[in-house]
Every structure is written in structure tokens, then in C-alpha cells.
């Protein structure tokens, strides 16, 4: 016997559906109506036939009361080929729900997204996460998707993007966006970062994550941030192969005074990079290749310094910097 495609936990909190059959019984998903967090994995299916069964142009207000009764706050949809018209239809209906967090992963969006009708209500998400989502529309996908969302989005995460650069002239500002995560886009690089950080479109960013994004030097990242007018409080550059030295011909970059936390862990550093901010609250240099304790003049003025997992650190060695946070135990790096 084949396992049930959908499983609801005994507290009506989490519901997970794995539709792997070629002709899935989508009605099984109805058991998720009372769940707060819902995950639907469509097994790589092409959802094109759905368009024949649903009226994507129907007024979503007719479903408003039904959708309002859903408890779902967080929805994950993955592994499918989705016509843009169907995605838009779903977003229009979900605008009447309590949905706050939407994750789309391993999706291929086909066709173009129609413009938002004047009477339509945008989806009031606080968090949107995309992983390995491809769009037929190329660089304009973010602007097209954005029009279906209310302007209150706080967290945007885009990983394994097929087109991490955006059509900046079409993108509207994200006035409430405080966290932007572009991690796991190894082809991004510093030039790509400049293209992705559309100038003045991200005025409220406090946390910027750039793990595994092909960044080369902290100074290059500083320049990209300065060009975009982005002033994060926290910057994560971990899991990049960073160079410690700066190109002498490159102009010196002044970091924003707003930056107080910098993560440079797992960056393959053999020495402390040049051109770091002069003052930081938190600096993480753990799991690098530092062969000697950094000298005070190599480091910013820092309250919390983490150096765990570097070769020079042997358990029991005196702490190399006042206020450092080393455990004395070499972590699994």
C-alpha cells in the first residue's frame, strides 16, 4: 500500500504533503486546512493541467470566507512546474488568508505574471523565501512578483537563483525590508551584488546575509553596499573564499558606521583581512586558517571576537584578545 501523501501532526500544527504519484489526489491536501505550518511538495509535477480545472480569472473574493478560516501562517510549496497564471491565482486567493511566511523552492515558473488588477488586494507577507526558483521572465521576476505583495515585507531570501540580478528600474522600494539573504548564490560575486542591491530600493535593511556568494574581499563588498546606499547593522560573509589583501589600485572604502556585526567565519583566511570597519561589536573569525594570534593593530576595536577553530588556537592557549568569546575548544570546522 502506498503511504498517505499528507500527514498532519497530532497538534494540528504541521502538515506535510508529498505528492509523488503521476496522477496525485490533490484533495488529500484538505486534511491540512487546520494546520498552522503547511508544506506541499509536488514531486516535480507540471501543474499546467490545473489551469484547465480552475478559473484563474475568477474573483477571489468569492473564496474570502473559506480562506479566512485557514489557520496557515507559513506555507512552503516545492518541486513543481507552475504556470505564472496559476501562481498569481493562488496569491490572489491567499491575500484573504492569515499567511505571513511563504517559501517557494525547486519551482519552475512558466509564462508571464499578469499585472495586478486595480481592485486586487496584495498578499500581506512578512517573509518570502525563494530557493532554486526559475522564472520565464528573467530579470524582471522580482518586480512582477512584488506587485502581488503588500509593501510590509520584512524578510526576503533568494537562494540558488537563476537570475540573482534584478531589473532595478522596475522594482519598487521595499520600505519595511529589514533582512535580505542572498546566500547560496555562488555565481553572484561582487559585481552581481552591485546589480542585485538596487540603489535606494532597500532603505531599511539591518541584516544582510551573503554566505557562499562568491565574494572576494570585504572591501569589495563595502563598495557594493556604498554604491547601493545599503547600511546593514549585521553582515554575514561566511563561507566565501575571501582574500585578506586588497587590490592596491582599488579605492579605499569607508564602512557605514551602522555596521556592528561582521561574520567572516569559514572564509579560508590566513590573516585578518585589510580594510575592516574600525569599530565593531561582534567579529566572527572562527574556522579560518589563521596560523598566529592576530595582533591588536590588525583588528578592529571589537567587543566580542570569536577565533575558535583556527590552527593557532590550541586548547589552553591564552585568549588572544580582550573580550574574546573563544571557548578553548576547537569546533568541528
Amino acid at each position: 500500500t502506498t503511504p498517505e501523501p499528507c500527514e498532519l501532526d497530532d497538534e494540528d500544527f504541521r502538515c506535510v504533503c508529498n505528492f509523488s504519484e503521476p496522477q496525485p489526489d490533490w484533495s488529500e491536501a484538505f486534511q491540512c486546512v487546520s494546520a498552522v505550518e503547511v508544506e506541499i511538495h509536488a514531486g516535480g509535477l507540471n501543474l499546467e493541467p490545473f489551469l484547465k480545472r480552475v478559473d484563474a480569472d475568477a474573483d477571489p473574493r468569492q473564496y474570502a470566507d473559506t480562506v479566512k478560516a485557514l489557520r496557515v501562517r507559513r506555507l512552503t510549496v516545492g518541486a513543481a512546474q507552475v504556470p505564472a497564471q496559476l501562481l498569481v491565482g493562488a496569491l490572489r486567493v491567499l491575500a484573504y488568508s492569515r499567511l505571513k511566511e511563504l517559501t517557494l523552492e525547486d519551482l519552475k515558473i512558466t509564462g508571464t505574471m499578469p499585472p495586478l488588477p486595480l481592485e486586487a488586494t496584495g498578499l500581506a507577507l512578512s517573509s518570502l523565501r525563494l530557493r532554486n526558483v526559475s522564472w520565464a521572465t528573467g530579470r524582471s521576476w522580482l518586480a512582477e512578483l512584488q506587485q502581488w505583495l503588500k509593501p510590509g515585507l520584512k524578510v526576503l531570501s533568494i537562494a540558488q537563483a537563476h537570475s540573482p540580478a534584478f531589473s532595478c528600474e522596475q522594482v519598487r522600494a521595499f520600505p519595511a525590508l529589514t533582512s535580505l539573504d542572498l546566500s547560496d548564490n555562488p555565481g553572484l560575486g561582487e559585481r552581481g551584488l552591485m546589480a542585485a542591491l538596487c540603489p535606494h530600493k532597500f532603505p531599511a535593511i539591518q541584516n544582510l546575509a551573503l554566505r557562499n556568494t562568491g565574494m572576494e574581499t570585504p572591501t569589495g563588498v563595502c563598495a557594493a553596499l556604498a554604491a547601493a546606499g545599503v547600511q546593514p547593522h549585521s553582515l554575514d560573509l561566511s563561507h566565501n573564499s575571501l582574500r585578506a589583501t586588497v587590490n592596491p589600485s582599488a579605492p579605499r572604502c569607508m564602512w557605514s558606521s551602522a555596521l556592528n556585526s561582521l561574520n567572516l567565519s569559514f572564509a579560508g583566511l590566513e590573516q585578518v583581512p585589510k580594510g575592516l570597519p574600525a569599530k565593531l561589536r561582534v567579529l566572527d573569525l572562527s574556522c579560518n586558517r589563521l596560523n598566529r594570534a592576530p595582533q591588536p593593530d590588525e583588528l578592529p576595536e571589537v567587543d566580542n571576537l570569536t577565533l575558535d577553530g583556527n590552527p593557532f588556537l590550541v586548547p589552553g592557549t591564552a585568549l588572544p584578545h580582550e573580550g574574546s568569546m573563544n571557548s578553548g575548544v576547537v569546533p568541528a570546522c
Epitope: 501532526d9 497538534e11 494540528d12 500544527f13 504541521r14 486546512v33 487546520s34 498552522v36 505550518e37 478560516a69 485557514l70 489557520r71 501562517r73 507559513r74 492569515r98 511566511e101 517573509s127
Partner: antibody, heavy 115, light 111 residues
């Protein structure tokens, strides 16, 4: 058998940040459910503060949202509460609780806000 | 926010009495087939204990003299035959919509 245990300072000064940790045994905080903080001022009723879910998603009571952060450390199977800018009105017994029908509770820890 | 109002605020009854506590919600706490309304018992100095979940389901280990009923906005907790150990404060709570809210409590004493 699932068990939850609150820990943290019993006395916090006004305007400072209250920090509590809940250690969970007999179940994983990253495999299912919501992991809540609920408080009860002396002689009063219960108030839900917020939760962090198995996925890391958080939800907070709007009345406290600007002051609350709930985070987790999955390696230690712990979740934590930070409540900033506390006043005497934040004096309460703080409970960590599993689920949204609150079937599993810690024994509670009294936090007094006083100078 | 969904407000929950319990009545009475306190009551005194004799051992063996049938006791009823009501909880009224400011809006429906139903989601399709289920009512997300739960009942708790709290004894002095102790954490609350779940008695009834989703309006009418008895939590494992709870004596069968406790029962719950109701839907949408009106709910009832019934103790069919009051026992001395039932002296406590009883709370209703909704988990249909965040913020998740509690009733103000009903204090039950023995005459």
C-alpha cells in the same frame, strides 16, 4: 517523556533585558511543534508571549512584539526569551510550553523586576 | 485579537455537584471541522494542566468527570461530580488565531 525546564535570573532591574532559556528533553525542538513562552503576573491570568516553531518561524503577541525576541539553539535543544526595557509590570512567573494546545509546561520561573 | 470571557469569575459548589463553566469568544474560534478552544486547570503554585482540547476531547490521564462542549463562540466545561481535588482556577484558551488568548479564569471552591 517530554520535559521542559526554564532557567535564568530571578531578579532583573527596570529598563534592562530579561533573558530566560528553556531546555527541552525527550523531544526535539527542530522536528515538530511550536515552542512557546507564556507568563502569569502574581495573582493574575495567563498571557501568551510568543513562539518559535520547529522551522525557526516566530510569532509574537503584538502587545509585546517590539520588546520580544525568541530564538533557539538546536544543538543544545534549547529556546530562549529576551524581553527588553522591562518594568515592574513584567514581574511574573514565566513558563515555557510546547504546542498550541498547551499540553506540556515547564514548572515556571518567577522573574521579579525591581531595582 | 479574540477576547475570551469566562463566567462566572468564581463559584462555590459542594462535593458531588455538577459544575458548569462557560467561555464566550468575541469571534468564532472554529476552523472548518474543529473548534480550537481548550480548557486548563491550575492549582496554586503549579503550572496549568490541559484538561480538554479542541472543545470536547479529553486529554490523556484526565478523569472522565471532565467534559467539554460547544462551537464557534460559545463553550462549556462541565465537571459531572465535583471532587475535593478539583479546587483550582480554570482557564479557557483559543489557538485558532494569533495572538493566542486566555479567558480571565474561573476560581472554583468547595462549599
Amino acid at each position: 517523556q517530554l520535559q521542559l525546564q526554564e532557567s535564568g535570573p530571578g531578579l532583573v532591574k527596570p529598563s534592562e533585558t530579561l533573558s530566560l532559556t528553556c531546555t527541552v528533553s525527550g523531544g526535539s525542538i527542530s522536528s515538530d511543534s511550536a515552542w512557546n513562552w507564556i507568563r502569569q503576573p502574581p495573582g493574575k491570568g495567563l498571557e501568551w508571549i510568543g513562539y518559535i516553531s520547529y522551522s525557526g518561524s516566530t510569532s509574537y503577541n503584538p502587545s509585546l512584539k517590539s520588546r520580544v525576541t525568541i530564538s533557539r539553539d538546536t544543538s543544545k535543544n534549547q529556546f530562549s526569551l529576551k524581553l527588553s526595557s522591562v518594568t515592574a509590570a513584567d514581574t511574573a512567573v514565566y513558563y515555557c510550553v510546547r504546542g498550541l494546545r498547551f499540553a506540556y509546561w515547564g514548572q515556571g520561573t518567577l522573574v521579579t523586576v525591581s531595582s | 485579537d479574540i477576547q475570551l470571557t469566562q463566567s462566572p469569575s468564581s463559584l462555590s459548589a459542594s462535593v458531588g455537584d455538577r459544575v458548569t463553566i462557560t467561555c464566550r469568544a468575541s469571534e468564532s474560534v472554529d476552523s472548518y471541522v474543529d473548534s480550537f478552544l481548550h480548557w486548563y486547570q491550575q492549582k496554586p503554585g503549579k503550572a496549568p494542566k490541559l484538561l480538554i482540547y479542541r472543545a470536547s476531547n479529553l486529554q490523556s490521564g484526565v478523569p472522565s468527570r471532565f467534559s467539554g462542549s460547544g462551537s464557534r463562540t460559545d463553550f462549556t466545561l462541565t465537571i459531572s461530580s465535583l471532587q475535593p481535588e478539583d479546587v483550582a482556577t480554570y482557564y479557557c484558551q483559543q489557538s485558532n488565531e494569533d495572538p493566542y488568548t486566555f479567558g480571565q479564569g474561573t476560581k472554583l471552591e468547595i462549599k
